[in-house]
Interface confidence: low
Amino acid sequence: SAPGEDEECGRVRDFVAKLANNTHQHVFDDLRGSVSLSWVGDSTGVILVLTTFHVPLVIMTFGQSKLYRSEDYGKNFKDITDLINNTFIRTEFGMAIGPENSGKVVLTAEVSGGSRGGRIFRSSDFAKNFVQTDLPFHPLTQMMYSPQNSDYLLALSTENGLWVSKNFGGKWEEIHKAVCLAKWGSDNTIFFTTYANGSCKADLGALELWRTSDLGKSFKTIGVKIYSFGLGGRFLFASVMADKDTTRRIHVSTDQGDTWSMAQLPSVGQEQFYSILAANDDMVFMHVDEPGDTGFGTIFTSDDRGIVYSKSLDRHLYTTTGGETDFTNVTSLRGVYITSVLSEDNSIQTMITFDQGGRWTHLRKPENSECDATAKNKNECSLHIHASYSISQKLNVPMAPLSEPNAVGIVIAHGSVGDAISVMVPDVYISDDGGYSWTKMLEGPHYYTILDSGGIIVAIEHSSRPINVIKFSTDEGQCWQTYTFTRDPIYFTGLASEPGARSMNISIWGFTESFLTSQWVSYTIDFKDILERNCEEKDYTIWLAHSTDPEDYEDGCILGYKEQFLRLRKSSVCQNGRDYVVTKQPSICLCSLEDFLCDFGYYRPENDSKCVEQPELKGHDLEFCLYGREEHLTTNGYRKIPGDKCQGGVNPVREVKDLKKKCTSNFLSPEKQNSKSN
């Protein structure tokens, strides 16, 4: 029988009455156009909803929008359109919400064709009040907040000017012209690329990379011949055109662009691309596209300086520049990532790594599932996860995989069980141990969300018909209760819960349709009375993460240490609460070869932990580029995985000598870089 339908499932007592008392309907006085929702701040309960309706006329499109505000997690909404003078808000810019709990909101208005500049509405009190400000430019992008100071904003104009405000959008100053891309770095630094000749497109590969650390008073050119740049963790990356041909290479800096090193990655041609898949302060996952229109490339993982890279995964599915990849960071367990590969027969298969890209394997077949038609052997197959690529291909997959840092070990995803991703209708699977084991959780496609740090999982069936039923589980998806939240079914459009999965409120969004009109409607359900009491010590159990062999002393060791967590017992129906903090106890492990990546010029044969020299580099001196100088590497093939905390045990030798020779890089070396002031 399907999960939740067998006799072992105990029902949550009197849940219908409890939920009925905590179900709040709000019908929006709007024609159905588009709706967007933003949470303002953390644990504030403030939600802004912007509804937009376009009426196409013969000559132009007339638009109207309404703004609503809730301060009780969506139970009640107030129409605050008058606070923005009933102005039509441009949905493509969304609602620019300030970082942390700044309470800042910027809305960009639609203005008539002949106006000198755009118009914004600003709030710094969680959208209680708004100030209208006319801009001296027409914005091309949404306002971007400095992560360090929410009063500092930057925006690009339609004429490629870089504009900065130091007083939360009250006054604006154009600090540079001919700008293609601008990003905030750390310490209120702005990085941006500029073109000299025609345009961003025409000058691609001939752009300059600039930096300002004082909001435009002075500038430093930190790179030339730039194709593009990106920030990830503490790394600044730039792809740079080679001198002699149309290829480009990645250069990396860890000091905001003062000094650069050439990354030991393959160069790419005109039709190829690089992509930073994930980055933290320790390392980076980099995708390098294969030549030709293959739809795949190679994942490389970096050392702690972002310079030396190891091949992590071949045939990694990534369709085109800015296209689709299934690469997913499983945030509920350290070191775990899931992605897809395109196999030789062109089928797509899911792979998982538990050690930050060191080794990839297939996902274990769920106990309660049979292999589908893609499986050659009916008894041996794997789980394959649907993510961005499947969604882009319009498969019946309403949601990407879901994990939350404070719902330890839980991963929920659509999938199919076979030799490859199937085009058939998927089911929903759950892992409670970070991806090591999986169980079919729900039959058919669903929307799902995690509440109360994993204490409740909520799901709604993905259906073309109007719905009025929500499913919920208090035991990590083993057993399900269904609740009819309205007598009149609605066409469902989305589930919304406060980011961070700490809330106990869920909002079900949709529209009602009658003969003449259709209106937006939301139902907000508070589960607080289902989880009647606060969890106590007895409700938690000790769980060793990454445990695969309890007999082994090193069991659970990943990246040099193991972690024990306090996890809520599945049988406990209680509130983790908004203040819940994940309790974990780390302990250091002895070093083994698993704690080392293969060094530059070395690789790990399949199913072997030893690193062997690449045949083409045997007998050659290993030299690579560092800070514009050539370095000689003495190594026996290993380097510690970034972020690995192991001590003692195996200790391979590694030494780097400065060869005092210049590298052949066309990138600006530090001494050639120039500065200027405004």
């Epitope: 319009k394 209708v425 993905h462 073309s464 109007p466 349709e513």
Partner: antibody, heavy 129, light 107 residues
Framework: QVQLVQSGAEVKKPGASVKVSCKAS????????MSWVRQAPGQGLEWMGI????????SYAQKFQGRVTMTRDTSTSTVYMELSSLRSEDTAVYYC??????????????????????WGQGTTVTVSS | EIVMTQSPATLSVSPGERATLSCRAS??????LAWYQQKPGQAPRLLIY???TRATGIPARFSGSGSGTEFTLTISSLQSEDFAVYYC?????????FGGGTKVEIK
């Protein structure tokens, strides 16, 4: 208009292979999957497998696993179905059919399977010694 | 695999009368079901998808109903061009499977 044009009739000996082509026109080739369905004389319809023109990924019915290969050429908007180790019971009309295969289009009433909406004219394959 | 069973195998109906065709799935296929019409020497033609939605250009006399395991195709008033074989097909789980067909013949 949208159409699928298949290659002509084939006569093959047992043990041989046959490769049937299906050329799509009138729509974006990569926007829809393609299924292959066969029909033996006087019998019903039998689904053989499906191909995604974007990546070329395939899913075959267990019965044909190991004998059937579906490929595509995006430059010519053509899908191919090759059946090997032919036997007399493979004598049938082979159809290609445009298949949304679980495509979820936005809006009420359209999220379920939308059916094989365009079919080729069929290719008769006769296997006889 | 999911087995689709159609009944009756043959249905004799007079023009202008109502015809009701049944299709049963061995397990739930939700609403992932389509109906096709096939005339001798022709390729099948899509009539109904999503269990109940008429395909483009299909006359209103054709209607589909059902969900889960039991489905029905109804032709409210048979026209001479409706005499053909009708197949149901599921697309809930691979492999796609067809029913054995119902032949609608002139009484």
């Amino acid at each position: 208009q949208v159409q699928l044009v298949q290659s002509g009739a084939e006569v093959k000996k047992p043990g041989a292979s046959v490769k049937v082509s299906c050329k799509a026109s009138g729509y974006t080739f990569t926007s829809r999957y393609m299924s292959w369905v066969r029909q033996a004389p006087g019998q019903g319809l039998e689904w053989m497998g499906i191909i995604n023109p974007v990546g070329g990924s395939t899913s075959y019915a267990q019965k044909f696993q190991g004998r059937v290969t579906m490929t595509r050429d995006t430059s010519t908007s053509t899908v191919y179905m090759e059946l090997s180790s032919l036997r007399s019971e493979d004598t049938a009309v082979y159809y290609c059919a445009r298949d949304p295969s679980g495509i979820a289009l936005a809006g009420p009433g359209s999220r379920y399977y939308r059916g094989m909406d365009v079919w080729g004219q069929g290719t008769t394959v006769t296997v006889s010694s | 695999e999911i087995v689709m069973t159609q009944s009756p195998a043959t249905l004799s109906v007079s023009p202008g009368e109502r015809a009701t065709l049944s299709c049963r799935a061995s397990q739930s296929v939700s609403s992932n079901l389509a109906w096709y019409q096939q005339k001798p020497g022709q390729a099948p033609r899509l009539l109904i998808y999503g269990a109940s939605t008429r395909a483009t250009g299909i006359p209103a006399r054709f209607s589909g109903s059902g969900s889960g395991t039991e489905f029905t195709l109804t032709i409210s008033s048979l026209q001479s061009e409706d005499f053909a074989v009708y197949y149901c097909q599921q697309a809930r789980l691979g492999p796609w499977t067809f029913g054995g067909g119902t032949k609608v013949e002139i009484k």
